[in-house]
């Protein structure tokens, strides 16, 4: 029950984060106009992965797209790759994880199957969230370099005074937006492969095998011997992972592969 | 076509206050802030305030702060314009402005302040 | 706030003749997010309100001449009429689009010679 409970809240976790991701890299606000000298300005710049908008004095916004590829700066290059990497391993992570919910009954696929398909999908979600927060982490920086660069700039000129003041950036909403989401799909990629350890079937259960003891006519049961008991053949002591029928010692020995939250 | 019709010319006493309307009509009306700009007798024309119709939120020039209010009723798609204790250099020609590049203009609302 | 100083301010000038006007403001109204001078120019007739000529200094409004152009950046700005038609006798104000409040130059009132 925890178990599937760790999965299905490491899956919503996962989806929320990724949905995060998702949200901020289509986001405009990546960079804000810093209004510290300006409060009063008329005309707000801001700027996102894709397009810079600017919003006037009649509230038309204005959005133009970065139309150029080789243009545009390494860093907002390698940005938006990290965020796109973030979305695509996020996406196949939710792909994987569905199939790999306990909940989700899908043929006669086997709990090591599921098992392992847990752990993809949360290492999918864990990657996928450090590339998130990765990138947003070098746009921010980038955005801390420029700020004090353009602040340094300011205040240069004809007897320190300028007539144009360099329009100065900081941190908009989708930083934030990208941080929290890389975060939960961080998480939620761990709540992942916490619960692909209680998915695993423990090594402690076989299947009841009768031994016939030469001239005599009695049957020993052993019921969950994990090494072997030194008589009789060891090759029927299986650990069994099929969804079949069990006998009624091995039903009080681990629960039942079929719990339904 | 976009259009702004405003309300009629008022007479008012000093310290009184007076209320302009404008309607607006041939654009979504929550598409564009809404300004307001006066002109007195041999003045140059002077910003009041502006207000976006979306979210009711205000700028007010500060020479006008705590004597001018703008409101908006968007079922109606007309904007108000309230500025109280009037004083007779408060005589001039108020107009409502939006649209992209503040293009359209209202026909001007002439408010008279005398005792 | 930004003041704005226009010369002359007043212009006698004949039907035909090229006419230049300045607006001078005390910050710079270009805007690096976009590379635009938020700078507007209007014309105003005795008892109308004023109508849009150009704005970002230089981007005609539609169904405005092409004899107006305007010209400039930062902080110096120019309107232009290259040859002056009876119905551009006015009075002509430039305005900053760039700060709060927004403000509103006196005005060049261009008469007949």
């Known amino acids: 029950m925890a178990v599937t409970a760790c999965q299905g809240l490491g899956f919503v976790v996962s989806l929320i984060g990724i949905a995060g991701i998702i949200a901020a890299t289509c986001m405009d606000q990546w960079s804000t106009q810093d209004l510290y000298n300006n409060p009063v300005t008329a005309v707000f710049n801001y700027q996102g992965l894709w397009r810079s908008c600017v919003r006037e004095s009649s509230g038309f916004t204005e959005c133009r797209g970065y139309f150029t590829l080789l243009g545009l700066p390494a860093m907002l290059q390698a940005v938006r790759a990290l965020m796109i990497v973030g979305i695509v391993l996020g996406a196949i992570g939710l792909l994987v994880s569905i199939f790999a919910l306990k909940c989700i009954r899908i043929g006669s696929m086997e709990d090591s199957a599921k098992a392992n398909m847990t752990l993809t999908s949360g290492i999918m979600f864990i990657v996928s969230g450090l590339c998130a927060i990765a990138g947003v982490s070098v746009f921010a920086n980038m955005l801390v370099t420029n700020f004090w660069m353009s602040t340094a700039n300011m205040y240069t000129g004809m007897g320190g005074m300028v007539q144009t003041v360099q329009t100065r950036y900081t941190f908009g909403a989708a930083l934030f937006v990208g941080w929290v989401a890389g975060g939960l799909t961080l998480i939620g990629g761990v709540m992942m492969c916490i619960a692909c350890r209680g998915l695993a079937p423990e090594e402690t259960n076989y299947k009841a095998v009768s031994y016939h003891a030469s001239g005599h006519s009695v049957a020993y049961k052993p019921g969950g011997f994990k090494a072997s008991t030194g008589f009789g053949s060891n090759t029927k002591n299986k650990k069994i992972y099929d969804g079949g029928a069990r006998t009624e010692d091995e039903v009080q020995s681990y629960p039942s592969k079929h719990d339904y939250v | 076509q976009v259009q702004l019709v405003q309300s009629g010319a008022e007479v008012k006493k000093p310290g009184a206050s007076v209320k302009v309307s404008c309607k607006a009509s041939g654009y979504t009306f929550t598409d564009y802030n809404m300004h307001w700009v006066r002109q007195a007798p041999g003045q140059r024309l002077e910003w009041i305030g502006y207000i976006n119709p979306n979210n009711g939120g205000t700028s007010y020039n500060q020479k006008f702060k705590g004597r001018v209010t703008i409101t908006v009723d968007t079922s109606a798609s007309t904007a108000y314009m309230e500025l109280s204790s009037l004083r007779s250099e408060d005589t001039a020609v108020y107009y409502c402005?939006?649209?992209?590049?503040?293009?359209?203009w209202g026909q001007g609302t002439t408010v008279t302040v005398s005792s | 706030d930004i003041v704005m100083t226009q010369s002359p301010s007043s212009l006698s000038v004949s039907v035909g003749d090229r006419v230049t006007m300045t607006c001078k403001s005390s910050?710079?109204?270009?805007?690096?997010?976009?590379?635009?001078?938020?700078l507007t120019w209007y014309q105003q007739k005795p008892g109308k309100a004023p109508k849009l000529l150009i704005y970002?200094?230089?981007t005609r409004e539609s169904g405005v001449p092409d004899r107006f152009s305007g010209s400039g950046s930062g902080t110096d700005f120019t309107l232009t009429i290259s040859s002056v038609q009876p119905e551009d006798f006015a009075t002509y104000f430039c305005q900053n689009d760039y700060s709060y409040p927004l403000t509103f130059g006196g005005g060049t009132k261009l008469e007949i010679k």
């Open positions: 910050q710079s109204l270009f805007n690096s997010g976009n590379q635009k001078n938020y």
């Open positions: 402005v939006t649209t992209r590049y503040l293009a359209v």
């Open positions: 970002w200094a230089s």
